[in-house]
């Protein structure tokens, strides 16, 4: 019963992580720049994402532009896109696999097979969390590095956008969910019996204990 609860918790966290990853990768809030005009008046804010960039004027008017050419994009941006897509697909696969092997489903009858399926799902989710973490951490590192680099002009200085924070949270949820699924598998399911399983009880020698040694080998 406890393992069923852990499975459900793990899958719930993983679903939240998947949704978080989807939103994080889709939103143009990876890099944010507030362009300050006269004194401290914000003239405009630029949001940059993996797929588009948006300019928000001080009037509240917003214009978004989808990146045109794939080949003209920086390699790190292309890599981030690829990692996000792979992470989403891998997490989705992990969730489908987890549902297949869950204690509360009857897709698979064999307990040992179920445990192996859930473990596989856990590993897939852990892996997808790591894949989300790579572009998020890489982008954050690049932003921070440029921000403190005295050779970088202000036009190129960026701040961490909401998508990065969401990405970290999503990666944590995916990894936590995957970790919980891995933990629900009792090691006994993977231990092969080392001798013939006896279908009867061997009476205890010391009648004092009153315990039957079932499955005794």
């Amino acid at each position: 019963m406890a393992s069923t609860g852990l499975e459900l918790l793990g899958m719930t966290l993983a679903v939240l992580g998947w949704l978080g990853t989807l939103v994080s990768c889709a939103l143009p809030l990876w890099k944010v720049t507030a362009f300050i005009g006269n004194s401290i008046v914000v003239a405009q804010v630029v949001w940059e994402g993996l797929w588009m960039s948006c300019v928000v004027q001080s009037t509240g008017q917003m214009q978004c532009k989808v990146y045109d050419s794939l080949l003209a994009l920086p390699q790190d941006l292309q890599a981030a896109r690829a990692l996000c897509v792979v992470a989403l697909l891998l997490a989705l696969l992990g969730l489908l696999v987890a549902i297949t092997g869950a204690q509360c489903t009857t897709c698979v009858e064999d307990e040992g097979a179920k445990a192996r399926i859930v473990l596989t799902a856990g590993v897939l989710l852990l892996l997808s969390g790591i894949l989300v973490l790579i572009p998020v951490c890489w982008t954050a590192h690049a932003i921070i590095q440029d921000f403190y680099n005295p050779l970088v002009a202000e036009a190129l200085k960026r701040e961490l956008g909401a998508s990065l924070y969401l990405g970290w949270a999503a990666a944590a949820l995916l990894m936590l969910g995957g970790g919980l699924l891995c933990c629900t598998c009792p090691p006994s399911h993977f231990e092969r019996p080392r001798g013939p399983r006896l279908g009867y009880s061997i009476p205890s020698r010391s009648g004092a204990s009153g315990l039957d040694k079932r499955d005794y080998v």
Partner: antibody, heavy 119, light 107 residues
Framework: EVQLQESRPELVKPGASVKISCKTS????????LHWVKQSHGKSLEWIGG????????IYNQKFKGKATLTVDKSSSTAYMELRSLTSEYSAVYYC????????????WGQGTSVTVSS | DIQMTQSSSSFSVSLGDRVTITCKAS??????LAWYQQKPGNAPRLLIS???SLETGTPSRFSGSGSGKDYTLSITSLRTEDAATYYC?????????FGTGTKLELK
């Protein structure tokens, strides 16, 4: 007092290279980035690039990439600019300048080094 | 690259005059503008940064103004030592670019 002392004028042949130096004093060398600016006779100023003496990081104007190489020697608080494969269009006065700490403007300049490319 | 244009290449001025030098950027530079003074045979000298902030040692008769793409350097009651070439420079983005220069000559 902050000072940037540049090397003597240079007369070089077309196709040759030249290395100009800029010796700094009066401030902590590694705390400010150093930049190089070209001024052709009677013309405006052109930014070549800059270097962070702290770690040797450089940034170049695309126009001078492959033409100019910026380096520093921390032990002597000196910045260098090497110009390769020179042609007559690189005959100019070259200034080294220190970037101000809060803005990307140049607050102290060297006196300039005149480079003449002629056969 | 951001182009910096100083419409007047030279001015013939009299002592005590008020002079205004203009500088136009090809795009918004968000007040990231510096003004330099250069006298013949000398290196440029930073007068103003941030479009309006006077550097230490810059006389109070100099002032800077503007925003967006358009900026001006004003000199009230011109003095002999102000005869020089003035350059604007944007430091909003790299490559850093300078204006074409405006030469002030005394009549």
């Amino acid at each position: 007092e902050v000072q940037l002392q540049e090397s003597r004028p240079e007369l070089v042949k077309p196709g040759a290279s030249v290395k100009i130096s800029c010796k700094t004093s009066g401030y902590t060398f590694t705390e400010y980035t150093l930049h190089w600016v070209k001024q052709s006779h009677g013309k405006s100023l052109e930014w070549i690039g800059g270097i962070n003496p702290n770690n040797g990081d450089t940034i170049y104007n695309q126009k001078f990439k492959g033409k100019a190489t910026l380096t520093v020697d921390k032990s002597s608080s000196t910045a260098y600019m090497e110009l390769r494969s020179l042609t007559s269009e690189y005959s100019a006065v070259y200034y080294c300048a220190r970037r101000a700490i809060t803005v990307y403007a140049m607050d102290y300049w060297g006196q300039g080094t005149s480079v003449t490319v002629s056969s | 690259d951001i182009q910096m244009t100083q419409s007047s290449s030279s001015f013939s001025v009299s002592l005590g005059d008020r002079v205004t030098i203009t500088c136009k950027a090809s795009e918004d530079i968000y007040n990231r503008l510096a003004w330099y003074q250069q006298k013949p045979g000398n290196a440029p000298r930073l007068l103003i940064s941030g479009a309006t902030s006077l550097e230490t040692g810059t006389p109070s008769r100099f002032s800077g103004s503007g925003s967006g793409k358009d900026y001006t350097l004003s000199i009230t009651s011109l003095r002999t030592e102000d005869a020089a070439t003035y350059y604007c420079q944007q430091y909003w983005s790299t490559p850093l670019t300078f204006g074409t220069g405006t030469k002030l000559e005394l009549k």
